[in-house]
């Protein structure tokens, strides 16, 4: 890996722009705080790869470590990752902010730790103090890391002077956890096994040379002893391990397995327990419920999640309308099953930018040789309503009609509202709901059609107005669970000439508003 400029430390000006390049023999990537940064990647003709990181409008908060690493960095050697430290001296930033994990430093033994108070300018003099003390402590400081040394259980702050201003860091809390001199850990290869499979447990003690292990387990209580094997983990000093291996487990081997460790020099002891479950055969069990009807909104992404327990690990398949689903190359569908604990799984179906065609009957099936479970639901795609047409006509009968047509899923709800006093509505006069009196001034007729192919409802509503004696603003509003839409039209009396209709301005759309809903088959007169 080659970084340009090479560093390992750069001091950049605040508000400036700076370009960093990293090249390597495979795809490379710039990272900061374990996150990939926005960057431009390229491949040259000679099969070298590069990534260009452009840092713009730099501030003190850009101070810190930057890493260039190969894109697939699993199992990389340390020299296959290059570190660069950037300082952006910024008088407006005192100490760089820390998250809670950095402010509270827990120890289990006397060991060197770092109090990570860092500044943006490597020229600043930084001192370490007890939280409410003035005396500077004689601890070495590294501008890139902080103060490193062996610290007592206290709280500490760092101080620096920027210009003529003394600046304090957050307080850092150093706390030594009280642990016994023997620290035992017990784990099992599996805590759930089928009868006939093996149970293998390990008990590990750290930091002691001579210890005695004693195991308690269900077989022992019935007098059937198993001889544990004790060994040293050679790659770690004084890590001693005891292995308890029970071949061909029986149902009676279910229960608590305890490892008790004693050390005779100081007469210390510690014990840890773990529960093992032996099952007759494997199982798959759904956890929680998924409703039989699920919803997704058109063009939005939707993740459907199923949680279940299983042993042994199952195969998971998803179906739509009885056809097997797989990750689509176009990235419209993503399937994933995660193992969140030893026997617990979460399977997710993600529909990216949902389409109408994705409505249907979905099934998730989880199975292995011993058991199977399946869960099904219907997915309904919700489509926000839109008013497609609002038109006014004058039939020969003398009445005037306004027709409103719209579509959506679930079924849209229609509300008609009318304004008589165009200048005053809706600013000065509140809307008035129609449907409280019996005088027939208007009639409403609504028809609903479900379009199978588009999987949405169409609503057509016709409002018949008996007596229009002055200009009237009529609004059709459609609503459903995922949205609303409206249109307005101005209805004028028959007597008003066409030219005058055109002269009614937007400002005139005011006055008393009447609401006419689907439920009101009659439109009533208002005072």
């Amino acid at each position: 890996l080659v970084i340009t400029p090479p560093g390992p430390e750069l001091i950049l000006n605040v508000s400036s722009t700076f370009v960093l390049t990293c090249s390597g023999s495979a795809p490379v990537v710039w990272e900061r705080m374990s996150q990939e940064l926005p960057q431009e990647m390229a491949k040259a003709q000679d099969n070298t790869f590069s990534s260009v990181l452009t840092l713009t409008n730099l501030t003190g908060l850009d101070t810190g470590e930057y890493f260039c690493t190969y894109n697939d960095s699993r199992g990389l050697e340390p020299d296959e990752r290059k570190r660069l430290y950037i300082f952006v001296p910024d008088p407006t930033v005192g100490f760089l902010p820390n998250d809670a994990e950095e402010l509270f430093i827990f120890l289990t033994e006397i060991t060197e730790i770092t109090i990570p108070c860092r500044v943006t300018d490597p020229q600043l003099v930084v001192t370490l103090h007890e939280k409410k003390g003035d005396i500077a402590l004689p601890v070495p400081y590294d501008h890139q890391r902080g103060f490193s040394g062996i610290f007592e259980d206290r709280s500490y702050i760092c101080k620096t002077t920027i210009g003529d201003r003394e600046v304090d860091s957050d307080a850092y809390y150093v706390y030594r956890l009280q642990v016994s001199s023997i620290n035992v850990s017990v784990n099992a290869v599996q805590t759930v096994v089928r009868q006939g499979e093996n149970i293998t447990l390990m008990c590990i003690v750290i930091g002691n040379e001579v210890v005695n292990f004693e195991w308690m387990y269900p077989r022992k209580e019935s007098g059937r002893l198993v001889e544990p094997v004790t060994d040293f983990l050679l790659d770690m000093p004084y890590h001693i391990r005891s292995i308890l291996h029970i071949p061909s487990a029986e149902l009676e081997d279910s229960g608590t397995y305890t490892c008790n460790v004693t050390e005779s020099v100081n007469d210390h002891q510690d014990e840890k327990a773990i529960n093992i479950t032996v099952v007759e055969s494997g199982y798959v069990r759904l956890l929680g419920e998924v409703g039989a009807l699920q919803f997704a909104e058109l063009h939005r992404s939707r993740t459907l999640q199923v949680v279940f327990e299983a042993y042994p690990p199952p195969t998971v398949l998803w179906f739509k309308d009885n056809r097997t689903l797989g990750d689509s190359s176009a990235g419209e569908i993503a399937l994933s099953t995660r193992n969140v604990s030893e026997t617990r799984y979460v399977s997710e179906l993600t529909l990216v930018r949902v389409k109408v065609a994705e409505a249907g009957h979905y099934t998730m099936r989880a199975f292995h040789e011993d058991a199977e479970v399946q869960l099904s639901f219907q997915l309904q795609i919700n489509v926000p309503v839109r008013v497609l047409e609002l038109s006014e006509s004058h039939p020969d009968s003398g009445e005037q009609t306004v027709r409103c047509r719209g579509r959506g899923m679930p079924q849209p709800n229609i509300i008609w509202s009318a304004c008589r006093d165009l200048k005053r509505c809706p600013r000065e006069l509140p809307p008035m709901l129609l449907g409280n009196s019996s005088e027939e001034e208007s009639q409403l007729e609504t028809n609903v059609t479900y379009w199978e192919e588009e999987q949405e409802f169409e609503v057509v509503s016709t409002l018949r107005l008996q007596h229009v004696d002055r200009p009237l603003s009529v609004r059709c509003t459609l609503r459903n669970a995922v949205g609303q839409d409206m249109q307005e039209v101005i209805v004028v009396p028959h007597s008003l000439p066409f030219k005058e209709q055109k002269l009614i301005s937007e400002e005139d759309l005011g006055g008393e508003q009447k609401l006419i809903s689907e439920e009101d088959l009659h439109h009533h007169h208002h005072h």
Partner: antibody
Framework: EVQLVESGGGLVQPGGSLRLSCAAS????????MSWVRQAPGKGLEWVAN????????HYVDSVKGRLSISRDNAKKSLFLHMNSLRAEDTAVYFC????????????????????WGHGTTVTVSS | DIQMTQSPSTLSASVGDRVTITCRAS??????LAWYQQKPGKAPKLLIF???TLESGVPSRFSGSGSGTEFTLTISSLQPDDFATYYC?????????FGQGTKVEIK
């Protein structure tokens, strides 16, 4: 200087509402749990509510559940207490305090006390 | 909820006296206990946390002890600045409860 300054107290009628604010300075506000504690006239301290660093976790004393609500704006380094359906017994000086709750260690939750307090703001509920 | 009971409610003492305040929890709280000092018209001040750890800047004449349900705050030699009200406070699963307070006044 590490500082907390409360504001927003005042006289309010029973059933009324109020919003208290607490402005933090001199520390990384977003890294700390925060609490509200109150003290009725001539009485002792009563913890009211607290909230974790990102606002995803809140806890309340039983007597205020459903009426008082704690929130925070990390960008503005501010803590709030929204008070609704106020009663005479809510009359008190309200303090905002920094709550030293470190991230969980193995199975342990450690606690280092409330180390920074504001001067308090007075809420009087009376008709 | 865990109740905290302090005793005595009021304590009269002289400068130089050794003073002990007791705090009892209605159920075990391990050592999750803090002590505060409050003077009239002022905000409380943290003295001790985790039952016995002295907060930075607090004079060493203050000390705390105890675990489970019984805790004590001791002032080894009372100073004029120590006349105040003292509160214990428990911490359990993110809820807190204060004791009713102990007022230390001049004899």
């Amino acid at each position: 200087e590490v500082q907390l300054v409360e504001s927003g107290g005042g006289l309010v009628q029973p059933g009324g509402s109020l919003r208290l604010s607490c402005a933090a300075s001199g520390f990384t506000f977003s890294s700390y749990w925060m609490s509200w504690v109150r003290q009725a006239p001539g009485k002792g301290l009563e913890w009211v509510a607290n909230m974790n660093q990102d606002g995803s976790e809140t806890h309340y004393v039983d007597s205020v559940k459903g009426r008082l609500s704690i929130s925070r704006d990390n960008a503005k380094k501010s803590l709030f207490l929204h008070m609704n359906s106020l009663r005479a017994e809510d009359t008190a000086v309200y303090f905002c305090a920094r709550d030293l709750v470190p991230p969980r260690q193995d199975d342990y939750y450690y606690y280092f006390g409330m180390d920074v307090w504001g001067h308090g703001t007075t809420v009087t509920v009376s008709s | 909820d865990i109740q905290m009971t302090q005793s005595p409610s009021t304590l009269s003492a002289s400068v130089g006296d050794r003073v002990t305040i007791t705090c009892r929890a209605s159920q075990s709280i391990s050592d999750w206990l803090a002590w505060y000092q409050q003077k009239p018209g002022k905000a409380p001040k943290l003295l001790i946390f985790k039952a016995s750890t002295l907060e930075s800047g607090v004079p060493s004449r203050f000390s705390g002890s105890g675990s489970g349900t019984e805790f004590t705050l001791t002032i080894s030699s009372l100073q004029p600045d120590d006349f105040a009200t003292y509160y214990c406070q428990q911490y359990n699963s993110y809820s807190r409860t204060f004791g009713q307070g102990t007022k230390v006044e001049i004899k």
